[in-house]
């Protein structure tokens, strides 16, 4: 029987700065029940605190509410391991909420085949970002990633859109079905999931001279 | 312990490569950014570029977008930086070093640097 | 970019007596400055990150002051163990640049 090895927090995600949650991995048991403790201070404070919620986020987390989210600060926190035989600290984690956004995908993932009579036919692709991300304060910036492939393919065709809502592509098979994701990334922060696939058929007369 | 150890000294000549490693052990490696520094014979410090080892999304200074590429192995949590077409002013020590937490650009672990040598 | 000035290059300065020194960035940069050590043959340190908070295990004879444009970093009582180079670094806007160093030197 030892005191337990040295946990390490090792992850934090906030879907829109206004909560988030930090994950730990205990480290070593020790062959004894060990009770795990998450400990933090703002940058310029030395009062501690305990983690307000273990419950939301799931084994080993702490999650913290809008009450206990503030911008622009830095947190350092620390999770302590204590079992009958001691007690060991992972290293401080500095965590800035900014930095650690993971929206959600994009929404409204529109496709369709356009076919000008004056210009070469294009695939028209549109979506709107995910309701939690607010956009009209300008706290946030989000940039966006196409992927799309021939329903067969193995490999993802994958376009950087920028800031843009709505994208245009030439080059495409005619006669396949092709599937199409978008996903999205504040300019700090973590890609969002891929939206749904969204399918689209491409007209055999599909002709890109 | 948190440790970026990389590769050994190298000598190179004009117009070649060079791919510096950094293998990164003592935390979980796809937790924080990595960015590359170099630094002249007697000179200050130059940012090259920075990867999030977690997706492998990059950010380079301009300066180095054309001739340096940042990959990572995340299998071997290793981080490597590879800088082509390379000329006797890119004779330098150059450093991996990971961000200090997950929020902005300031560098609590370094390396040990890796001297390379630009010479015909 | 922002151009990070510092100043002066050298600082000559006796042990026990107080260092201060300065950087200047060329744009407005906040608070987003970090200060690091760096000896000879050894790979720069991390002293201070966000203008004024000392990292973890740094002595707290290590301060800085400022915001904005002009900051100063100020080492109390200087130990032997001190005298080195020491640079500023901006993380405000891309490409994150460093100052060009003072040295401080046993006078």
């Known amino acids: 029987q030892l005191p337990p090895g040295k946990p390490e927090i090792f992850k934090c995600r906030s879907p829109n700065k206004e909560t988030f949650t930090c994950w730990w991995r205990p480290g070593t048991d020790g062959g004894l029940p060990t009770n795990y403790s998450l400990t933090y201070h703002r940058e310029g404070e030395t009062l501690m605190h305990e983690c307000p919620d273990y419950i939301t986020g799931g084994p080993n987390s702490c999650h913290f509410g809008k009450q206990y989210t503030s911008m622009w600060r830095t947190y350092i926190m620390m999770v302590n391991a204590t079992n009958q035989m001691g007690s060991s600290f992972s290293d401080e984690l500095y965590v800035d909420v900014t930095y650690i956004v993971q929206p959600d995908p994009p929404l409204e993932l529109a496709v369709e085949v356009k076919q000008p009579e004056d210009r070469k036919p294009y695939l028209w692709i549109k979506w709107s970002p995910p309701t939690l991300i607010d956009l009209k304060t300008g706290w946030f910036t989000l940039l966006y990633e196409i992927r799309l492939k021939p329903e067969k393919a193995a490999e993802w065709e994958i376009h950087f859109a920028g800031q843009q809502t709505e994208f245009k592509i030439l080059s495409l098979h005619p006669g396949q079905k092709y599937l199409v994701q978008v996903r999205c990334k504040p300019d700090h922060g973590y890609w969002s999931a891929w939206s749904p696939a969204t399918f689209i058929q491409i007209p055999s007369d599909f002709t890109m001279n | 312990e948190v440790q970026l150890v990389q590769s050994g000294a190298e000598v190179k000549k004009p117009g070649s490569s060079v791919k510096v490693s950094c293998k990164a052990s003592g935390y979980t490696f796809t937790t924080y950014w990595m960015h590359w520094v170099r630094q002249a014979p007697g000179q200050g410090l130059e940012w090259i570029g920075e990867i999030d080892p977690s997706d492998s999304y990059s950010n380079y200074n301009q300066k180095f977008k054309d001739r340096a590429t940042l990959t990572v192995d995340k299998s071997t949590s290793t981080a490597y930086m590879e800088l082509s077409s390379l000329r006797s002013e890119d004779t330098a020590v150059y450093y991996c070093a990971r961000n200090g937490g997950l929020g902005p650009a300031w560098f609590s672990y370094w390396g040990q640097g890796t001297l390379v040598t630009v010479s015909s | 970019e922002i151009v990070m000035t510092q100043s002066p290059a050298t600082l000559s300065v006796s042990p026990g007596e107080r260092a201060t020194l300065s950087c200047k960035a060329s744009?407005?940069?906040?608070?987003?400055v970090a200060w690091y050590q760096q000896k000879p043959g050894q790979s720069p340190r991390l002293l201070i990150y966000s203008a004024s908070n000392r990292y973890t295990g740094v002595p707290a004879r290590f301060s800085d002051s400022g915001s904005g444009t002009e900051f100063t970093l100020t080492i109390s009582s200087l130990q032997s163990e001190d005298f080195a180079v020491y640079f500023c670094q901006q993380y405000s806007s891309y490409p994150w640049t460093f100052g060009g160093g003072t040295k401080v030197e046993i006078k």
């Open positions: 744009q407005y940069v906040g608070t987003a």
